[in-house]
Interface confidence: medium
Amino acid sequence: KESCDVQLYIKRQSEHSILAGDPFELECPVKYCANRPHVTWCKLNGTTCVKLEDRQTSWKEEKNISFFILHFEPVLPNDNGSYRCSANFQSNLIESHSTTLYVTDVKSASERPSKDEMASRPWLLYR
């Protein structure tokens, strides 16, 4: 029987290379059974994770999983860093692994990723 605990499916050491100035959506895959949990995003600052209170977020519901999305409109250079989503469920706090955004300045961005780069770093597809 499938567990009815809330699960957050951010892979350990996941990362995204993104371009300053572009919009970007950071997804937190959330699995739950009946009631959708309250999910928040925070940004790591040393050992503490600072809650992102004033940022635009949304839910995307799919058949077997939901996504809690943090919107960057647009990405700014200081968005560089590690993020974590967490869910409050039945008085429990469930935290995801952190995911890291590597923000590239437009000035130094190469014209486009090479095929080798795309093969070895598939997250570049989300630029």
Partner: antibody
Framework: QVQLQQPGAELVKPGASVKLSCKAS????????MHWVKQRPGQGLEWIGM????????NYNEKFKSKATLTVDKSSSTAYMQLSSLTSEDSAVYYC??????????WGQGTSVTVSS | DIVLTQSPASLAVSLGQRATISCRAS??????????MHWYQQKPGQPPKLLIY???NLESGVPARFSGSGSGTDFTLNIHPVEEEDAATYYC?????????FGGGTKLEIK
């Protein structure tokens, strides 16, 4: 080299819809946002919205939300913009542009849409 | 939405002289040391062409007679010395937030 091919012109009747195409080549279509810009004859440029071909994620200018619908066909590396309930105000040149960091760094030649009965 | 006001709406400059075009934003388009303002050139029957990005960076292949400056809400495009092929309409555009907006354009005529 990067190319964005758009049909030269479309003539449509008031109240009808039109689907404009933008065929991309010379780069990885799914890696870059595509945006669309409107230019009325003798007027300035208006940003309509954009779509990410990989995810289908879209962002619209509120002004065009009920007018334009952006889609893509990854298999043919083509972006589309459907314009509905056309009026004379929609007569314009519509450009697609490959997006890089908030800039349109490659542009199609534009499709001229004329709304006339 | 951020409103971009360009001035003048048109100007005529003698060959070899300096053309200066201004763009004022209704709120700051600068943050974290970056100014999200860009300049385009458009000639009749052609799509816009990117000249300057992030306020002051020359796009690859654009002649060095084009330069951009400014931060916050006030930006300037300079062309010096002006050449005949520079006759065109110039637009500023910001990408600080959605929706992106363009200035109303400045038409440059060469005397």
């Amino acid at each position: 080299q990067v190319q964005l091919q758009q049909p030269g012109a479309e003539l449509v009747k008031p109240g009808a819809s039109v689907k404009l195409s933008c065929k991309a080549s010379g780069y990885t279509f799914t890696s870059y946002w595509m945006h669309w810009v409107k230019q009325r004859p003798g007027q300035g440029l208006e940003w309509i919205g954009m779509i990410h071909p990989n995810s289908g994620s879209t962002n619209y200018n509120e002004k065009f939300k009920s007018k334009a619908t952006l889609t893509v066909d990854k298999s043919s590396s083509t972006a589309y913009m459907q314009l509905s309930s056309l009026t004379s105000e929609d007569s314009a040149v519509y450009y697609c542009a490959r997006k890089r960091g908030g800039l349109g760094d490659y542009w199609g030649q534009g499709t001229s849409v004329t709304v006339s009965s | 939405d951020i409103v971009l006001t360009q001035s003048p709406a048109s100007l005529a400059v003698s060959l070899g002289q300096r053309a200066t075009i201004s763009c004022r934003a209704s709120k700051s388009v600068s943050t974290s040391g970056y100014s999200y303002m860009h300049w385009y050139q458009q000639k009749p029957g052609q799509p816009p062409k990117l000249l300057i990005y992030l306020a002051s960076n020359l796009e690859s292949g654009v002649p060095a007679r084009f330069s951009g400056s400014g931060s916050g809400t006030d930006f300037t495009l300079n062309i010096h010395p002006v050449e005949e092929e520079d006759a065109a309409t110039y637009y500023c555009q910001h990408s600080r937030e959605l929706p992106y907006t363009f200035g109303g354009g400045t038409k440059l005529e060469i005397k």
